[in-house]
Amino acid sequence: RKIPKVGHTFFQKPESCPPVPGGSMKLDIGIINENQRVSMSRNIESRSTSPWNYTVTWDPNRYPSEVVQAQCRNLGCINAQGKEDISMNSVPIQQETLVVRRKHQGCSVSFQLEKVLVTVGCTCVTPVIHHVQ
Amino acid sequence: GITIPRNPGCPNSEDKNFPRTVMVNLNIHNRNTNTNPKRSSDYYNRSTSPWNLHRNEDPERYPSVIWEAKCRHLGCINADGNVDYHMNSVPIQQEILVLRREPPHCPNSFRLEKILVSVGCTCVTPIVHHVA
């Protein structure tokens, strides 16, 4: 599937649209809202009943080069006594984001959009239990 | 920008950094991953900090549909199925990159945009302070 063109009847393609070769699109990678700072809750990854750690992955052929991935610290969840309760499960919560991949073919370079699945944190769930005969 | 390793045999005219504007293939790699979190898992219902998913649609953006999580309760669900208000349901937020049509309504011209989305909720034990 390709990126959908604006096919809605209430949209008219403006005259000001830049010319783009067939099968490709123009992408400005100067990020909108690049400098907005988010006020994330302090230390939720440590205070959660399903705590997690962060790992930074780095790839120079990807834009952005740094992507942060979370990993659940435990299989179970942390109970009120601070002990792991394995009757509950710590599970990852994931979200898709877009990155630009730079590809080298000989001396030519091409760019490809890529969907990346990022693990953003963990949550504690009640497992679905099946008794196998 | 980002420094890119080059084939040493290539001409030196190539910029080491990502250029400000690039032409990219219309096909997106890994595009078939499931974008509806309701279909991918039922964690939003089974979590001790359950959440509802709200559809956010914007035809000037790709992807045009993004699902936003809102925690169902202030507290967390305990073993008896009741809300325990000594614990907190807290949204897990993530900055993601999307495409914004620029100029508006143009079919094949985009700019990257960073947006903050709530992906799900997690149960947190707060540190308690008694205010004098």
């Epitope: 809750s41 205070r47 | 202030l74 707060p126 308690v128």
Partner: nanobody, 116 residues
Framework: EVQLVESGGGSVQAGDSLRLSCAAS????????FGWFRQTPGKEREFVAG????????EYANSVKGRFTISRDNAKNTVDLQMDSLKPEDTAVYYC?????????WGQGTQVTVSS
């Protein structure tokens, strides 16, 4: 440091109304939710009502639903609890709670007495 100032407690007759207020001040903080617990002698503190700061979503204990209304003023960092149709069993010390997700602040409490 965070300060919480509670006001509005007192003694009333059953069926009467009372309005509690709580104002938060101090360092810059990002509020998760703001609300009220209550406690009677020999019992645990119980949740009464809370309001989420981001979207004004409210939650109430079953015992006060339909009688108590919680509201907020974003600009002033205040939360009010309008208590109508009060009952003797609402007699308790009411504590204001400011929740910042990973840190929670409790006020000193204000006495509410409802006599029959």
């Amino acid at each position: 440091e965070v300060q919480l100032v509670e006001s509005g407690g007192g003694s009333v007759q059953a069926g009467d109304s009372l309005r509690l207020s709580c104002a938060a001040s101090g360092r810059a903080f990002s509020i998760n939710w703001f609300g009220w617990f209550r406690q009677t002698p020999g019992k645990e503190r119980e949740f009464v009502a809370g309001i989420r700061w981001s979207d004004a979503y409210t939650e109430y204990a079953n015992s006060v639903k339909g009688r108590f209304t919680i509201s907020r003023d974003n600009a002033k960092n205040t939360v009010d609890l309008q208590m109508d149709s009060l009952k003797p069993e609402d007699t308790a010390v009411y504590y204001c709670v400011l929740d910042l997700s990973t840190v929670r602040y409790w006020g000193q409490g204000t006495q509410v007495t409802v006599s029959s």
